[in-house]
Amino acid sequence: MKVTGIFLLSALALLSLSGNTGADSLGREAKCYNELNGCTKIYDPVCGTDGNTYPNECVLCFENRKRQTSILIQKSGPC
């Protein structure tokens, strides 16, 4: 019983750490903001789910459109 309780608590802790399952856990969608005006060249890197570093979020969004891909933002900062 004690072992089962510890196991359940551990499982709950793991679930809370991992967050939601599905797309949310992979990353968030990049926003183009003002797509018609393009993106500035300000270097504020984000790491894509493809393992590539993008100069900023807007650039990732643009590349997704131009390349017809669906790369998400894995984390802020370089990969």
């Epitope: 018609l36 005006n37 393009g38 993106c39 500035t40 060249k41 270097y43 894509g48 493809d50 590539n52 570093t53 993008y54 100069p55 807007c58 650039v59 990732l60 643009f62 590349e63 459109r65 131009k66 390349r67 017809q68």
Partner: antibody
Framework: QSVKESEGGLFKPTDTLTLTCTVS????????VSWVRQAPGNGLEWIGI???????DYASWAKSRSTITRNTNLNTVTLKMTSLTAADTATYFC?????????????WGPGTLVTVSS | AYDMTQTPASVSAAVGGTVTIKCQAS??????LNWYQQKPGQPPKRLIY???TLASGVSSRFKGSGSGTQFTLTISGVECADAATYYC????????????FGGGTEVVVK
């Protein structure tokens, strides 16, 4: 800010072409670079692009025999094209995208002539 | 495929006249269209981007318009220096593309 293609020259059919675009005054981690060619007396033909992320896209006709890579430390972008034929005879240009992302080819190199002949 | 069709292939204009070049995309490219001018032995020079925005240092005699699939480059008050070949280029997609450029229009100034 500038881009310049390496020397072209004379190649034989089936040879592999390697051209280098040397860039100065900007970072390849922030700017994408395209390759475009122009056969004598013909129009402009897009070959492909390497984006700021390092991902590359190619024209459908070039995909199977072209590779575009970059070296951000050396400030170079390289085009490799295999299985050359006489139809690949052209002036090859590299071009950098604009300061506003999404609008390519604002800065062009002078071009380099590649001749394929037996 | 985003194929670009440019018309006419060649046009003749008198000094001071007006030239109109059309570019049609096979599917909508929003406003992602560039216009270039190329003279023999030189690389292309970008005139207009985002369909209607004049590139830095380009004369206001050049005007771009259109969106979606239909675009126009108008050269007013044509000068001898405008004799060149003009190309449109879609900048919307790089995926599964044959060529981002139109076939070109040669402008001859009389």
């Amino acid at each position: 800010q500038s881009v310049k293609e390496s020397e072209g020259g004379l190649f034989k059919p089936t040879d592999t072409l390697t051209l280098t675009c040397t860039v100065s005054g900007f970072s390849l981690s922030i700017y994408g670079v395209s390759w475009v060619r122009q056969a004598p007396g013909n129009g402009l033909e897009w070959i492909g692009i390497i984006y700021a992320s390092g991902s590359a896209d190619y024209a459908s006709w070039a995909k199977s025999r072209s590779t575009i890579t970059r070296n951000t430390n050396l400030n170079t972008v390289t085009l490799k094209m295999t299985s050359l034929t006489a139809a690949d005879t052209a002036t090859y240009f590299c071009a950098r995208e604009d300061d506003t992302y999404g609008y390519t080819s604002s800065i062009w190199g002078p071009g380099t002539l590649v001749t394929v002949s037996s | 495929a985003y194929d670009m069709t440019q018309t006419p292939a060649s046009v003749s204009a008198a000094v001071g006249g007006t030239v109109t070049i059309k570019c049609q995309a096979s599917q909508s490219i929003s406003s992602y269209l560039n216009w270039y001018q190329q003279k023999p032995g030189q690389p292309p020079k970008r005139l207009i981007y985002r369909a209607s925005t004049l590139a830095s240092g380009v004369s206001s005699r050049f005007k771009g318009s259109g969106s979606g699939t239909q675009f126009t480059l108008t050269i007013s008050g044509v000068e001898c220096a405008d004799a060149a070949t003009y190309y449109c280029q879609q900048d919307y997609s790089s995926n599964n593309i044959d060529n981002t450029f139109g076939g070109g229009t040669e402008v001859v100034v009389k």
